[in-house]
């Protein structure tokens, strides 16, 4: 139960203005009406309230809206958003992208807080899927946002949204995430011509299967080593030396520097040494000439 103190004579707030910064905490509680505050939320941000005063204003809004704030209030929260807990935010129903942008702006330059993560979660769940405009907005504020989603969450991203993804947005994605995103990207960019297609699909290739890598090797794409090193090991292993040479083009020389690292190391172990020698890079560790290679996975399948 809150201790109730009467508002001193003449201090009743008629509007939300600068005079309120001189009010003590108990005066704000007694003299500022929550319904009035709700109508003038857009003014709060322009007034240099202390953190303690912002706490009171938050409690005032909680008093007026016990089931969660309406969007008309949420969009004007400004710095008051930093006072919200994830529990508060779970009560909200945010549907407007403008509201989302306004709140992300408040947190700009900081790491994604639990509040922001909850807000984004509420927003995306409300929309049903991660559409292009939302993805555009989220990755603009948080380049690593996409890679913070689980493969299950990523499955709700429609292929059309992939156009909003920039290469840096995928920097921290792991193979499981790229496995989900790659087929969507392939679908999204399917009508582009060879070189344009490769530029767009390149960032997603960490989720590409062997067949698609083989197809790319036929298109003179000149994949850089950084991209090659991010490919799935199981997708690279079946590629022949000739296919890798075509895939990398002039960048094939970079294999020497990476010969001790996956997937290059594992790929080398699967190639005949005399095939590797044709590259003239001095790659060692291939299967010696005269050795028979048994594909155990095929043998298991037959048995």
């Amino acid at each position: 139960e809150v201790e109730k103190t009467a508002c001193p004579s003449g201090k009743k707030a008629r509007e939300i203005d600068e005079s309120l910064i001189f009010y003590k905490k108990w005066e704000l509680e007694a003299c500022v009406d929550a319904a009035l505050l709700a109508t003038q939320m857009d003014r709060v941000n322009a007034i240099p309230f202390t953190y303690e005063q912002l706490d009171v204003l938050k409690h005032k809004l909680d008093e007026l809206y016990p089931q969660g704030y309406p969007e008309s209030v949420i969009q004007h929260l400004g710095y008051l958003f930093l006072k919200m807990s994830p529990e508060d935010i779970r009560k909200w129903n945010v549907t407007s992208l403008e509201t989302l942008k306004a709140l992300l702006e408040v947190n700009k330059g900081h790491e994604m807080s639990p509040q922001v993560a909850t807000l984004i979660d509420r927003f995306v769940k409300g929309r049903g899927q991660l559409d292009k405009d939302t993805l555009d907005t989220l990755t603009a504020f948080y380049p690593g946002y996409l890679c913070s989603l689980s493969p299950e969450e990523l499955s709700s991203v429609p292929p059309s949204s992939i156009w909003a993804v920039r290469p840096q947005d995928l920097d921290t994605c792991d193979p499981r995430q790229l496995d989900v995103l790659y087929p969507k990207a392939r679908l999204a960019f399917q009508n582009m011509n060879g070189s344009e297609y490769f530029v767009k699909i390149q960032s997603f290739l960490g989720g590409a299967p062997t067949e698609d890598l083989k197809a790319l090797s036929q298109q003179n794409v000149s994949m850089d080593l950084a991209t090659f090193m991010k490919l799935r090991t199981d997708a690279v292993l079946p590629l022949t030396v000739a296919e890798v040479q075509k895939l990398l083009g002039p960048h094939v020389e970079g294999l020497k520097a990476e010969e001790r690292h996956r997937p290059v190391r594992d790929w080398i172990l699967r190639q005949r040494q005399d095939d590797l020698d044709t590259l003239g890079l001095g790659l060692q560790g291939g299967i010696p000439n005269g050795y028979l290679v048994l594909d155990l996975s095929m043998q298991e399948a037959l048995s």
Epitope: V2, K4, C7, R14, E29, A30, C31, V32, D33, A34, A35, L36, A38, T39, H59, K60, E63, L64, Y65, P66, Q67, P70, S72
Partner: antibody, heavy 119, light 108 residues
Framework: EVQLLESGGGLVQPGGSLRLSCAAS????????MSWVRQAPGKGLEWVSN????????NYADSVKGRFTISRDNSKNTLYLQMNSLRAEDTAVYYC????????????WGQGTLVTVSS | EIVLTQSPGTLSLSPGERATLSCRAS???????LAWYQQKPGQAPRLLIY???SRATGIPDRFSGSGSGTDFTLTISRLEPEDFAVYYC?????????FGQGTKVEIK
């Protein structure tokens, strides 16, 4: 079912006092703004006062400021209106109403209690 | 304070006709903060429309609200016998939460 039941009305002399009560049920009274609205005989509605649920922040129409006091007892789910220095122009049916902050309107009303100020 | 002026004072119409009631504010009112009420003789008012255009629970769709800024309208598309009553607009943007003086819709 939401119910608001006013009581305490009656005949009072000018300058006298009266205390109206409104018993609320069927909703979470402790989370709800409450209002008083009055209607003079044959006239329109006049908003009188409201009170917030937690901090009991109050607001009044200029015509009653300094004479009327709105209050609430959350433990009893009851709203009050203490009316002092009553005047003939305060004669009206007084309604207790629930303010819906989400719809921004008075969504439930009591049936009203008549206050007559006359000598 | 915000003064709400309703017009006409009285509207004489027959059942089945369309009723258009006006509410004008002395200063701009955000549509979220304008409501309409219906009151029948001997009864408490009833919330009809909130947020200028949203129907309250249980209100038939022949009632509709519109408007923004200073001009708001309540429309009853086809008057039913039970619709003859007094209608009030109210603003909750600023204190006091004023009502208009009312429009009486009577049977012609």
């Amino acid at each position: 079912e939401v119910q608001l039941l006013e009581s305490g009305g009656g005949l009072v002399q000018p300058g006298g006092s009266l205390r109206l009560s409104c018993a609320a049920s069927g909703f979470t009274f402790t989370q709800t703004y409450m209002s008083w609205v009055r209607q003079a005989p044959g006239k329109g509605l006049e908003w009188v006062s409201n009170i917030s649920p937690t901090y009991s922040t109050t607001n009044y129409a200029d015509s009653v400021k300094g004479r009327f006091t709105i209050s609430r007892d959350n433990s009893k789910n009851t709203l009050y209106l203490q009316m002092n220095s009553l005047r003939a122009e305060d004669t009206a049916v007084y309604y207790c109403a629930r303010y819906n902050a989400y719809q921004i309107g008075l969504d439930y009303w009591g049936q009203g209690t008549l206050v007559t100020v006359s000598s | 304070e915000i003064v709400l002026t309703q017009s006409p004072g009285t509207l004489s119409l027959s059942p089945g006709e369309r009723a258009t009631l006006s509410c004008r504010a002395s200063q701009s009112v955000s549509s979220s903060y304008l409501a309409w009420y219906q009151q029948k003789p001997g009864q408490a008012p009833r919330l009809l429309i909130y947020g200028a255009s949203s129907r309250a629970t249980g209100i038939p769709d022949r009632f509709s609200g519109s408007g923004s800024g200073t001009d708001f309208t309540l429309t009853i598309s086809r008057l039913e016998p039970e619709d003859f009553a007094v209608y009030y607009c109210q603003q909750a943007l600023g204190y006091p939460h004023t009502f208009g003086q009312g429009t009486k819709v009577e049977i012609k």
